[in-house]
C-alpha cells in the first residue's frame, strides 16, 4: 500500500501544536485511504529544508527568499503548491516589487546613483533585497559592508532598521531609522510617504502600495514606475514594469520522489474542509496562538504549481538575479558598455554542430547552449542559461507568454532593404499527392497526417485550429487514423507514423526524421496522406533541390494543395489556396538582452548572411541543406521589427486569438507554467 502520509515540518511549539490540530481534524474528514498528516518539528526553516531534502519530512511553507535557499544544491527542492490571496475568481499568488517615482522627476533606472531613496526596511524583499540586489553591480566598490556601499550610492536614504550610528546616510531621510510604525517612513506605506512628502526621489515598495495609499486615480497619475529597460510606465502597468515578480508563500517538496500529487490532494481537501469561512472548530488560515502558523493568516486558498515549474522559473529571472547577486557578491570585472557574448540555444546534435561552427567563426561573439526541445530552450532563455533563438510563430506565442520578446524577424523574400522591412508572413498549406484525387479539406477524417511539430504554426496551430472549429474537441489523434506530429505523447496515434529510432521517435527535434517542414513533407512522400507545411516546402524539396535519396527524384507537379472551400489547386497557386497567413519566424530573447542580441545579430548577418555566395567553405548563417538548422534555410535576412516588439504586436491579433482558442487543446507544460506566473 503506498504511504499516503505527508510529513509536515513545523518550526516552533505553536506551529507544532497547530500541525497536530491539522492532523487530527483531517483524520476526522478524510477517508482512511486518503492522505494524512504527520508532524515533524525542527528548530528553523533551514532545518526543515534539510529535513525534506534528507527525506525526514515532506513539506513546509516558505517565503520567496527561503524558496531560493531550498532550491540550491544540495537541497534541490521545488515549489509544489502556492498560497493565494484575494478572491478565488482573481487569485493573487505573486506580488510585484516596483520602483515608484514622481512623474516630473525625469530620471531612469540606470540614473539612480546620487538620488535619494526610500526603503520599507533593511533586509526586506521589495524594499531592500530586490532593488539592492539588482543594483548590486552598480554599487561603488568595496561592496562590503553592503550598507556602506548603498549609502555611498544614493545621496541619502531612509532604510528603517539600519544602524544609524554606523551608516548615518541610510537614516538621513528618517532620523533614527526606527524599525516600527513609530517611524513614519517604515514599511510599505511609510516608504511611499517618504516619496510623497518629497523626502526621497524613489520608493521601493510593492505594486499594491500606491493603490492602498492613493484611492484617487488623478493622484496616482502623479507617479510612475521605473522599468528595468530604462523606460517609465504608469503605475497600473506594473505587470510590464517591475523589478521582480515575487511569490508570496509557497509549499516546497523534493524534486524527485517529492509526493507533490499527494501534497496537493491533502491541501486541496484541507481547503475544502477548513479553508476561509469553512469551519468553526479548525481554520487552516488562522493562528490563534501566534501569527502565520504553517500558512499565512491572510491566505485565501491554495493553487497547484504546474509540474514543469522549477524554483528558478517560479521565482523568475529578476528575483533570482537579485538574490544571487546579494548572496554571492560577484560581478563582472568592470561593467562595460560592451555586449557579452550571446548564448544561442541549439536543438539537439545537428543544430549544436552548426551553432559551434558559428561560434568559431564569430570569434567569441556567439556561444552555444543545447537543449532537447524548443520548450526546454525557451525555459533556458527565461532563466538566463541561454539568451536567444529563432522560433516559429507558435513558439513565439509561448515565449511571449513566458515574458520573452521578439527582437528580429526572419525575412524570406529578396528586397533592396531587406533588414528594414519585416514581411507580412508566409502561407500555411495542406499538401497532398496528386494521385490521391478524391482527398479534400472536407474528408480528412481517418486519413494519415504529417505535421512539422505540435505547437508550430503551419504544422499544427493553423490546421488544428481550423479543425477544432469544425469538430469542437481536442481529440485530433482520433480524427486522423495515424500520423506524425513530433512532440505528441509517445503512445498517441500521432506518433505512429514517425520514423525516429528508439527514444528519438516523435521527438520535436532533428533526431526525428519527420520533424520540421522538410520532415513533414518526407512523411507525406513516404507514408502519409496530407502534410501541413509552409508554401515554400514543396518547391524547396523537389526538382532535385534536395539531394537526399528520398527527395532527389521528386517532382512538384505530383503534389497539390487542399483549399478550404473543398477544391484543390497546383502547388504554385498557394496565394489563392492556403489555410492562413503565418507570421514569419522570429528571434526571441529576454528584455534585458534585447539591445545586445539585436546589435550582435545584425553584425553577424553582415558577416555570414545571404551576402556570402560560396557556402562550401565559408560559414553561412542561413544554410543547412534543407535542415532549417537555427534559422529557416530560405531566410534572406533578419529584419528589424520597428514597433512590433511584443509577441502580441508581432504575431497579430488574429493569430494570437487563434492560438488562444487552441489553448484548450494545449499539451504545453511550459505554457501552463508561464500562465501560472502571468494568467
Amino acid at each position: 500500500v503506498p504511504d499516503k502520509t505527508v510529513r509536515w515540518c513545523a518550526v516552533s511549539e505553536h506551529e507544532a501544536t497547530k500541525c497536530q490540530s491539522f492532523r487530527d481534524h483531517m483524520k476526522s474528514v478524510i477517508p482512511s485511504d486518503g492522505p494524512s498528516v504527520a508532524c515533524v518539528k525542527k528548530a528553523s526553516y533551514l532545518d526543515c529544508i534539510r529535513a525534506i531534502a534528507a527525506n525526514e519530512a515532506d513539506a513546509v511553507t516558505l517565503d520567496a527568499g527561503l524558496v531560493y535557499d531550498a532550491y540550491l544544491a544540495p537541497n534541490n527542492l521545488k515549489p509544489v503548491v502556492a498560497e493565494f490571496y484575494g478572491s478565488k475568481e482573481d487569485p493573487q499568488t505573486f506580488y510585484y516589487a516596483v520602483a515608484v517615482v514622481k512623474k516630473d522627476s525625469g530620471f531612469q533606472m540606470n540614473q539612480l546613483r546620487g538620488k535619494k531613496s526610500c526603503h520599507t526596511g533593511l533586509g526586506r524583499s521589495a524594499g531592500w533585497n530586490i532593488p539592492i540586489g539588482l543594483l548590486y553591480c552598480d554599487l561603488p566598490e568595496p561592496r562590503k559592508p553592503l550598507e556602506k556601499a548603498v549609502a555611498n550610492f544614493f545621496s541619502g536614504s531612509c532604510a528603517p532598521c539600519a544602524d544609524g550610528t554606523d551608516f548615518p546616510q541610510l537614516c538621513q531621510l528618517c532620523p533614527g531609522c526606527g524599525c516600527s510604525t513609530l517611524n513614519q517612513y517604515f514599511g510599505y506605506s511609510g516608504a511611499f510617504k517618504c516619496l510623497k512628502d518629497g523626502a526621497g526621489d524613489v520608493a521601493f515598495v510593492k505594486h499594491s502600495t500606491i493603490f492602498e495609499n492613493l484611492a484617487n486615480k488623478a493622484d496616482r497619475d502623479q507617479y510612475e514606475l521605473l522599468c528595468l529597460d530604462n523606460t517609465r510606465k504608469p503605475v497600473d502597468e506594473y505587470k510590464d514594469c517591475h523589478l521582480a515578480q515575487v511569490p508570496s508563500h509557497t509549499v516546497v517538496a523534493r524534486s524527485m520522489g517529492g509526493k507533490e500529487d499527494l501534497i496537493w490532494e491533502l491541501l486541496n481537501q484541507a481547503q475544502e474542509h477548513f479553508g476561509k469561512d469553512k469551519s468553526k472548530e479548525f481554520q487552516l488560515f488562522s493562528s490563534p496562538h501566534g501569527k502565520d502558523l504553517l500558512f499565512k493568516d491572510s491566505a485565501h486558498g491554495f493553487l497547484k504549481v504546474p509540474p514543469r515549474m522549477d524554483a528558478k522559473m517560479y521565482l523568475g529571472y529578476e528575483y533570482v538575479t537579485a538574490i544571487r547577486n546579494l548572496r554571492e557578491g560577484t560581478c563582472p570585472e568592470a561593467p562595460t558598455d560592451e555586449c557579452k557574448p550571446v548564448k544561442w540555444c541549439a536543438l539537439s546534435h545537428h543544430e549544436r554542430l552548426k551553432c559551434d561552427e558559428w561560434s568559431v567563426n564569430s570569434v567569441g561573439k556567439i556561444e552555444c547552449v543545447s537543449a532537447e526541445t524548443t520548450e526546454d530552450c525557451i525555459a533556458k532563455i527565461m532563466n538566463g542559461e541561454a539568451d536567444a533563438m529563432s522560433l516559429d510563430g507558435g513558439f513565439v506565442y509561448i515565449a511571449g507568454k513566458c515574458g520573452l520578446v521578439p527582437v528580429l524577424a526572419e525575412n524570406y523574400n529578396k528586397s533592396d532593404n531587406c533588414e528594414d522591412t519585416p514581411e507580412a508572413g508566409y502561407f500555411a498549406i495542406a499538401v497532398v499527392k496528386k494521385s490521391a484525387s478524391d482527398l479534400t479539406w472536407d474528408n480528412l477524417k481517418g486519413k494519415k497526417s504529417c505535421h512539422t511539430a505540435v505547437g508550430r504554426t503551419a504544422g499544427w496551430n493553423i490546421p488544428m485550429g481550423l479543425l477544432y472549429n469544425k469538430i469542437n474537441h481536442c481529440r485530433f489523434d482520433e480524427f486522423f487514423s495515424e500520423g506524425c506530429a513530433p512532440g505528441s505523447k509517445k503512445d498517441s496515434s500521432l506518433c505512429k507514423l514517425c520514423m525516429g529510432s528508439g527514444l528519438n521517435l516523435c521527438e520535436p527535434n532533428n533526431k526525428e526524421g519527420y520533424y520540421g517542414y522538410t520532415g513533414a513533407f518526407r512523411c507525406l512522400v513516404e507514408k502519409g496522406d496530407v502534410a501541413f507545411v509552409k508554401h515554400q516546402t514543396v518547391p524547396q524539396n523537389t526538382g532535385g533541390k534536395n539531394p537526399d535519396p528520398w527527395a532527389k527524384n521528386l517532382n512538384e507537379k505530383d503534389y497539390e494543395l487542399l483549399c478550404l472551400d473543398g477544391t484543390r489547386k497546383p502547388v504554385e497557386e498557394y496565394a489563392n489556396c492556403h489555410l492562413a497567413r503565418a507570421p514569419n519566424h522570429a528571434v526571441v530573447t529576454r528584455k534585458d538582452k534585447e539591445a545586445c542580441v539585436h546589435k550582435i545579430l545584425r553584425q553577424q548577418q553582415h558577416l555570414f548572411g545571404s551576402n556570402v555566395t560560396d557556402c562550401s567553405g565559408n560559414f553561412c548563417l542561413f544554410r543547412s541543406e534543407t535542415k532549417d538548422l537555427l534559422f529557416r534555410d530560405d531566410t534572406v535576412c533578419l529584419a528589424k521589427l520597428h514597433d512590433r516588439n511584443t509577441y502580441e504586436k508581432y504575431l497579430g491579433e488574429e493569430y494570437v486569438k487563434a492560438v488562444g482558442n487552441l489553448r484548450k487543446c494545449s499539451t504545453s507544460s511550459l505554457l501552463e507554467a508561464c500562465t501560472f506566473r502571468r494568467p
Epitope: 554542430l353 532533428n510 562550401s616 567553405g617 565559408n618 543547412s624 541543406e625 535542415k627
Partner: nanobody
C-alpha cells in the same frame, strides 16, 4: 567520402603535454572551418576549439591559455597542442570538418587522452 584520422593521444601526468593531429582526406580542408571536440566518459560531446579558414581561433573557457589549435593546409592536417593537462581533460578527442554541413556526420575514431598520476 570525407575521412578524418586522429592520432597523438596517450597517458600523461597532470601538468604534462600532448600534441594531437588530425589528417583529413576527401575534404575541402583548406577552405573549411575545423574543430576539435571531446567526449569524457558518460558525458556529451563538447567543442574544445575551432579554427576558421583564415586562421581565427576559438577555445572553450576551461582550456584557454593551455591549448593551441593550428592547421597546415598543405598537409590537410589539423593540430591541437595541449599543455598543462589536468585530470578533467581526460576524454576521447575527435576532429571534425564543418564543410559537410552538420548532418552527414563525419567523425573519426577519435584518440584517447588520459591524464592521471
Amino acid at each position: 567520402e570525407v575521412q578524418l584520422v586522429e592520432s597523438g593521444g596517450g597517458l600523461v601526468q597532470p601538468g604534462g603535454s600532448l600534441r594531437l593531429s588530425c589528417a583529413a582526406s576527401g575534404s575541402i580542408f583548406s577552405i573549411a572551418t575545423m574543430a576539435w571536440y571531446r567526449q569524457a566518459p558518460g558525458k556529451g560531446l563538447e567543442l574544445v576549439s575551432g579554427i576558421t579558414r583564415s586562421g581565427s581561433t576559438n577555445y572553450r573557457d576551461s582550456v584557454k591559455g593551455r591549448f593551441t589549435i593550428s592547421r597546415d593546409n598543405s598537409k590537410n592536417t589539423l593540430y591541437l597542442q595541449m599543455n598543462s593537462l589536468r585530470a578533467e581533460d581526460t576524454a576521447v578527442y575527435y576532429c571534425t570538418d564543418y564543410s559537410s554541413r552538420y548532418y552527414h556526420d563525419y567523425w573519426g575514431q577519435g584518440t584517447l587522452v588520459t591524464v592521471s598520476s
